[in-house]
Amino acid sequence: EPCVEVVPNITYQCMELNFYKIPDNLPFSTKNLDLSFNPLRHLGSYSFFSFPELQVLDLSRCEIQTIEDGAYQSLSHLSTLILTGNPIQSLALGAFSGLSSLQKLVAVETNLASLENFPIGHLKTLKELNVAHNLIQSFKLPEYFSNLTNLEHLDLSSNKIQSIYCTDLRVLHQMPLLNLSLDLSLNPMNFIQPGAFKEIRLHKLTLRNNFDSLNVMKTCIQGLAGLEVHRLVLGEFRNEGNLEKFDKSALEGLCNLTIEEFRLAYLDYYLDDIIDLFNCLTNVSSFSLVSVTIERVKDFSYNFGWQHLELVNCKFGQFPTLKLKSLKRLTFTSNKGGNAFSEVDLPSLEFLDLSRNGLSFKGCCSQSDFGTTSLKYLDLSFNGVITMSSNFLGLEQLEHLDFQHSNLKQMSEFSVFLSLRNLIYLDISHTHTRVAFNGIFNGLSSLEVLKMAGNSFQENFLPDIFTELRNLTFLDLSQCQLEQLSPTAFNSLSSLQVLNMSHNNFFSLDTFPYKCLNSLQVLDYSLNHIMTSKKQELQHFPSSLAFLNLTQNDFACTCEHQSFLQWIKDQRQLLVEVERMECATPSDKQGMPVLSLNITCQMNK
Amino acid sequence: QKQYWVCNSSDASISYTYCDKMQYPISINVNPCIELKRSKGLLHIFYIPRRDLKQLYFNLYITVNTMNLPKRKEVICRGSDDDYSFCRALKGETVNTTISFSFKGIKFSKGKYKCVVEAISGSPEEMLFCLEFVILHQPNSN
């Protein structure tokens, strides 16, 4: 069975084809080759000589037991080599010779028992080494690591490392890898020698499900003393053994580390006193809790020095009390409990993401809701009922506003966005908005992107609501049940490049409303009910138009519409997916491609 | 279509068939077997995925006595610092995991429950597997 050609001459998928040897019938130009799940078993030298241009090679689960000297010799362009799930028993010292451009080596679940005799010391270009899910017992980083000066990611998770000693990291003192991210999760740790991490600098350290008791956790974290880490991730996994007890003593040792960003990811335990618990983390710049349950929500009003707070997928009794002077970014998403938003006091806040919480807002939105006048980014998407009771007074700095899939109330009672002269992006898609007031978008003089799909208009008519949006480049009006539009609806949109009118109820096409759209490049009218043109004589669309989508409409392929069908043929160079433009009537022509019709009308006259 | 039996409990019998053409082997054990009136137990899965499990989610199509419920999307792996350790599993890596579950206070009417589980993962998104579970429910007391 042949390999699947994914990208001609470049990418080939030969997965699970029962190959016992490497195929030689693929082009020399092959750059990406997936040979996974084939019983190759043995790689002799120069095994891939037929692929001189290869950049990515996937040999996952190929039952490889032996890799000879120079197996990959000649692959000087290879950047990624994946060996996951091979039961390697014999790995020659020169197994990886010739890989002068290798950046990513994945040797997950390959029976690797030690880093010491893993022959990779010459791979100077290596950026990522993944040796997770192996049998490694010692964390001693061999001397050859001093050659791996580009290493950025080392994944040692799911190994058998129990202890870390001062000598294990000696090589890092000789060559401070300022950018190294280290994952030690799921190793059964019980001892970290104090001083082992002294004066070590890491970009990221991940320790999840490493400790089987609170005491072990406490002493191991104390053993990290002296470490300078940009991002520290602690926590557990839901499907692994969890700590039975967790209290403030667990994290006391963090006072002896220098941490820029901290994250606690999943804890099967109720956090009831976060002030004491995170006492050593009051001055990290970014603080993050993922999948934890928080009992006392008042604690977030303590004077933490965080600039970025992230609360994701957590459980709260009620919406937390947030009073944080220095906070610039707040991400509060996909949380449960506390369904009603309550005011926060965050005077420095610039970025606020409150999406996917099922929250309801009794009144939205003004400075008093968020306690800031600096807000530039506000995401309230995928929430509950949001009642518009103020037009963003004190929030004039906003540049990005997203309400999609929330239920907006009172949108047509006043000019909701009047203050937002700096707003660039607005998404009110699928918000149950019914446009019944022409001043709905007044004030949005800087707006470039407007998404309002899935809403509705009074009498299914699009009025002149865009008159002030002179900088608009993208407009989505799809799924709005529109049947008609004002001939001057788009007259002020001279910068508009993309207009989506798909999935509406238009029965005819008219070029007149688009005459002022001098920058229009994409017009999508797919999934309407277009049968014919509004007027007999259709003019040309703006000369800038490059893509016109008229697919899945109800074209009437009869003589009375001959001029319209001819006009469509004349637009051929603009049309996309022409094979999906089919006749709907008459019944004998149903399903026929519109462009293949030979329209001669004598016989039917 | 070959049917794979999972388990029987006092009020339910659970089995599954594959609904994709690849039919990559997957081993599923539930201990103790699910009782629909209330249940607490462990789900054990042994599987070698044909693609990375990063950004794994399930599309669930549930049918109750021939009545179709709306499609549900259950995100399992978001992509970074996920709740489950198997979210970091790579294509070809053995996934051998036990997940605890519990639910209570749901009253099910007697009949045949079908649940098509479409597992989607990776970037670009592709189907990982598709299983159709059949639960025959015979409540002791309705």
Epitope: D24, F28, G44, Y46, S47, F48, F49, G70 | -
Partner: nanobody, 112 residues
């Protein structure tokens, strides 16, 4: 056991030509991809010519138009014709059958 015996290396001047040949024993080359790989001192090794069973060939840009690979299945031999040799063509040239490795190298030295 597969053996590859090479001949034709030596010292030549820039601009001159040289022909390398490689005779295989213990295997029939008619079903094998064959090629030449070179290793210059202090430089990254590279494949300089490959020929498949159907006669299709590959050359990197560095030798394209100057080198030509050919095979004689009857003689179980593969050849490398090297024309307009440059100083940077100096190195040890190996005859290769994928998965079976190279034979002994043959030294080619191009002098000015």
């Amino acid at each position: 056991e597969v053996q590859l015996v090479k001949s034709g290396g030596g010292l030549v001047q820039a601009g001159e030509s040289l022909r390398l040949s490689c005779v295989a024993s213990g295997i029939s080359i008619s079903t094998e991809v064959m090629g030449w790989y070179r290793q210059a001192p202090g430089k990254q090794g590279e494949s300089v010519a490959i020929i498949k069973t159907d006669g299709s060939t590959y050359y990197p840009d560095s030798v394209k138009g100057r080198f030509a690979i050919s095979r004689d299945n009857a003689k179980n031999t593969v050849y490398l014709q090297m024309n307009s040799l440059k100083l940077e063509d100096t190195g040890v040239y190996y005859c290769v059958i994928p998965g079976r490795g190279p034979g002994q190298g043959t030294q080619v030295t191009v002098s000015s």
